[in-house]
């Protein structure tokens, strides 16, 4: 049997026998275009494609629509994989989304959605989520039904205000909604009573900016 040389996600890489976490090259569905992603081969059985990571504030997340579309940052540290790739990938097969969160007091929590996909750019990469479980709140901190994606230069929220400009970062803002994992990074002891921080309301409550976040996806049938 001929060895697979291109992979659409980290689950395929894991199943090929490459089971060490790290940076791998993925290929866009039905294309030869490539993208580098961090693959988490340790959490919950491995095979996770990391689509977002925050840990230290080293990367500016107040970026343009184009940058969020194409991705930015470093897969070894803080980064956004790219809306276009994630939209194409999650449009081909059913994916689950796992969001891992860390606070400044040493606690960790997660939210798991059993079906996740992004609509195409023509629909502003609207997020679709179902089936929430996990420890980071019984109510989804990403508003349901899903919102369109907004950035500082593309205002698609459900608010007469401009959520992305006020709250910082690109996100699926509602009006403006209970979360923003792409907000401004605040260090410890400066992370409370912040409206533009890294927020997951139904875990940490009002105005709390988190220490670290990871968003990762994997095929539902993995």
């Amino acid at each position: 049997k001929e060895e697979q040389t291109t992979f659409r996600d980290c689950a395929e890489i894991f199943k090929s026998g490459l089971t060490t976490s790290g940076i791998y090259t993925l290929t866009f569905p039905n294309s030869t275009e490539e993208i580098k992603a961090y693959c988490d081969m340790d959490v919950g059985g491995g095979g996770w494609t990391v689509i977002q990571h925050r840990e230290d504030g080293s990367v500016d997340f107040q970026r343009t629509w184009k940058e969020y579309k194409e991705g930015f940052g470093s897969p070894l540290g803080e980064y956004w994989l790219g809306n276009e790739f994630v939209s194409q990938l999650t449009g081909q097969h059913r994916y689950v989304l796992k969001i891992q969160l860390k606070d400044w007091e040493g606690n960790e929590a997660h939210s798991l959605y059993d079906h996740f996909y992004l609509a195409g750019e023509e629909s502003n990469y609207r997020i679709h989520l179902t089936g929430l479980t996990g420890t980071a709140g019984k109510i989804s901190s990403i508003s349901q039904p899903g919102s369109d994606f907004s950035t500082k230069d593309s205002d698609n929220d459900k608010c007469i205000c401009k959520c992305s400009q006020m709250l910082s970062g690109g996100w699926w803002f509602d009006a403006c909604g209970p979360s923003n994992l792409n907000g401004q990074y605040y260090p410890q002891k400066q992370n409370t009573n912040k409206f533009n921080g890294i927020k997951w309301y139904y875990w940490k409550g009002s105005g709390y900016s988190l220490k670290a976040t990871t968003m990762m996806i994997r095929p539902a049938d993995f």
Epitope: K162, A175, G207
Partner: nanobody, 123 residues
Amino acid sequence: EVQLVESGGGLVQVGDSLRLSCAASGRTFSTYLMVGWFRQAPGKEREFAAGIWSSGDTAYADSVRGRFTISRDNAKNTVYLQMNSLKTEDTAVYYCAGSYDGNYYIPGFYKDWGQGTLVTVSS
């Protein structure tokens, strides 16, 4: 400790005007995403009336749009609600609240609240 204190309520006639004030101590209003005015009529749920975002943008409930105006004075750390052409259905306790999160029209997302000031509009 954060304290929001409302003032300016009272008894007025239909068609009259009233200006409510909300003063903050222990925090500047600029730290909030939104400062909102909510109202609660007897036997009814608390509802959003008007709000002002950190950016200065404003929002109004359909029932008050065109009659009420929200503004703020950063130097005085005070938010105002100018209420014109008052109607009997505007009778309620009016609350000032500050929010860091969530959808602006949902009371549950607001963290800090005042004690309220009563507005009664009689015919």
